[in-house]
Interface confidence: low
Amino acid sequence: TGADTEAVVCVGTACYTAHSGKLSAAEAQNHCNQNGGNLATVKSKEEAQHVQRVLAQLLRREAALTARMSKFWIGLQREKGKCLDPSLPLKGFSWVGGGEDTPYSNWHKELRNSCISKRCVSLLLDLSQPLLPSRLPKWSEGPCGSPGSPGSNIEGFVCKFSFKGMCRPLALGGPGQVTYTTPFQTTSSSLEAVPFASAANVACGEGDKDETQSHYFLCKEKAPDVFDWGSSGPLCVSPKYGCNFNNGGCHQDCFEGGDGSFLCGCRPGFRLLDDLVTCASRNPCSSSPCRGGATCVLGPHGKNYTCRCPQGYQLDSSQLDCVDVDECQDSPCAQECVNTPGGFRCECWVGYEPGGPGEGACQDVDECALGRSPCAQGCTNTDGSFHCSCEEGYVLAGEDGTQCQDVDECVGPGGPLCDSLCFNTQGSFHCGCLPGWVLAPNGVSCTMGPVSLGPPSGPPDEEDKGEKEGSTVPRAATASPTRGPEGTPKATPTTSRPSLSSDAPITSAPLKMLAPSGSPGVWREPSIHHATAASGPQEPAGGDSSVATQNNDGTDGQK
């Protein structure tokens, strides 16, 4: 499903929108991106509170969210192959829109180390608790969901849209309705700040169509960092109300004339702006002309000002904004240099960690070290990376290539390895024979044997090893243990039927299998297929089943 209900909060120079709808993180990012934004950043406590506010707005409208816990994607992700860095607040995650490693974090629980698959962060809301502004949503990391598969996705997401500036909401001096349409395609009638390039439709009147007047305004940049609607005087004014309705729409003072008309005014130390509604301080620094962390310093007699930058920054050509000094140009790091606001940070490539001689040096991470290996079986450390391997009888599996999966030799591509019954076990296999037949010394063929009521023959003992020399079973290049990690063979018998020709008779009675010692007591009827052997005895009607285990200790039958 797509993104449904949305809520919006605009503050500072950004708007946050919250959406419900089960999307993967990639789909959510795409949705934000289509409207010119990104999944939201939460770079400070203040920003966390803005995001919480928009979520509170959404949750009050969204009756469908009945689960106790709810999650919403934000723009914090860690790419596949990038490892966790517990020393950083963001733990190696980074914001989708780029930007530095910010100091604020609010992790729900300690993160487990994994470098294998992409991980994404969502805000975890406990809906059973009141959403107090003091209790900010926790960060929860996990899989990023999969497109088109709602079951694996979470309840919603938060977008962030950044703007050059904002206009103040339009002030109505009488009854009317304002509808704002933002550049990110949201309509709202109550925004605390209205983003640059938004449109405002004002319908004046109290719903009586005859009296309704309409006005249309656009939030424009009137001068550098000065944004307004280009309207003059309060809107929807009515002699009937004068200053009594919303203070006449005036920012500060409202002065009423005898005829029901009124004017806006300002308190001492403030001046009325061109919109004839808003008041601004006469102090040149009060409009915060300096940006990017620059401090406004008043000139003599309070007439003009200069901007001053903190350490690690310098004024740009406008003399209003501070830009970071890029210390990385001097190549102070061994591998990666990250320029940070007011400084820099050395980082190591994936597979390396800080260490070694010298400032900013890096050394290889031994991913295979004890207690750290991501591999299920074998792990080989390489310079800057690692690779997993499996013991004989297993192949690499799993989306990240770290797991090992048993190879079923009984259904292998080369056809059955046994002449009669084949039992797959964890990491190996063994052959067996139908009742009345016994396993030949090569551990593969069956020969007619005396009918015996004793127990079936189990795996050959150590002293049997020598008998198998010269067997026709192909050898594998290296040996691996007979049993898998669980230590118990899984017996799934497959019957290779020894026969003289393809039309040899097959007994119609089901074959009752006896469990070999040391294997599970749950058995499946063997499936019967024709062997390719051109000769061999016909299968008898009854008797014992003889079983031998193929060793992988240098004897035949190994993988």
């Epitope: 707005q57 107090l132 502004p133 003091s134 109550s190």
Partner: antibody, heavy 120, light 111 residues
Framework: QVQLVESGAEVKKPGASVKLSCKAS????????MHWVRQAPGQRLEWMGE????????YYNQKFKGRVTITVDKSASTAYMELSSLRSEDTAVYYC?????????????WGPGTTVTVSS | DIVLTQSPSSLSASVGQRVTITCRAS??????????MNWYQQKPGKAPKLLIY???NLESGVPSRFSGSGSGTDFTLTVSSLEDEDFATYYC?????????FGGGTKVEIK
């Protein structure tokens, strides 16, 4: 200066409803939450609920859920609290108070209070 | 609900005396490194007045003889040297969890 002014005292019969008003001035009404707190004679202060005037979102003390309704008129910078199904134990002084929007929502400005008497 | 227990419920003191009032919460009112405990002063027939917010921050305009401390469940309001206008009832309040709750009050009377 910042102030909250409440409506006058009320005398009501059990089972009736009362609607109190609180007019704000001297600050941007939509930038602060508005709360209602009551104090019965000799009792501790009791928080009843709050409203975000910018979007009319409300949170109530579960004790009063269903009986209390908080609303605002943004154009008049006024908050209202209506308490229904009145009983004698609702006799109290009712205060409106504002709190900051974020973080610790302490009550930095209070109205003078309205006395509500419920008596048959 | 978080229950706030104030002690003592009343005390008699003289002008110039140091007074300490305690407030104990039934569970922690700390969250993300902040303590959501506030103190108010109320005089008869008047509305409460904020003195201290977030356990130890003095509200602007409040005399510096008032101070607050504590974290978790135990909090203290101290008046270093009582003045005439300080004889009143003092309430603690937690804003960490809904419903926001108040203590039972401590009445400070003239000895």
């Amino acid at each position: 200066q910042v102030q909250l002014v409440e409506s006058g005292a009320e005398v009501k019969k059990p089972g009736a409803s009362v609607k109190l008003s609180c007019k704000a001035s001297g600050y941007t009404f939509t930038s602060y939450w508005m709360h209602w707190v009551r104090q019965a004679p000799g009792q501790r202060l009791e928080w009843m609920g709050e409203i975000d005037p910018s979007a009319s979102y409300t949170y109530y003390n579960q004790k009063f859920k269903g009986r209390v309704t908080i609303t605002v008129d943004k154009s008049a910078s006024t908050a209202y609290m209506e308490l229904s199904s009145l009983r004698s134990e609702d006799t109290a002084v009712y205060y409106c108070a504002r709190s900051v929007y974020y973080g610790n929502k302490y009550f930095d400005v209070w109205g003078p209070g309205t006395t509500v008497t419920v008596s048959s | 609900d978080i229950v706030l227990t104030q002690s003592p419920s009343s005390l008699s003191a003289s002008v110039g005396q140091r007074v300490t009032i305690t407030c104990r919460a039934s569970q922690s009112v700390d969250y993300a490194g902040d303590s959501y405990m506030n103190w108010y002063q109320q005089k008869p027939g008047k509305a409460p007045k904020l003195l201290i917010y977030a356990a130890s921050n003095l509200e602007s305009g409040v005399p510096s003889r008032f101070s607050g401390s504590g974290s978790g469940t135990d909090f203290t309001l101290t008046v270093s040297s009582l003045e005439d206008e300080d004889f009143a009832t003092y309430y603690c309040q937690q804003t960490n969890e809904d419903p926001r709750t108040f203590g039972g009050g401590t009445k400070v009377e003239i000895k």
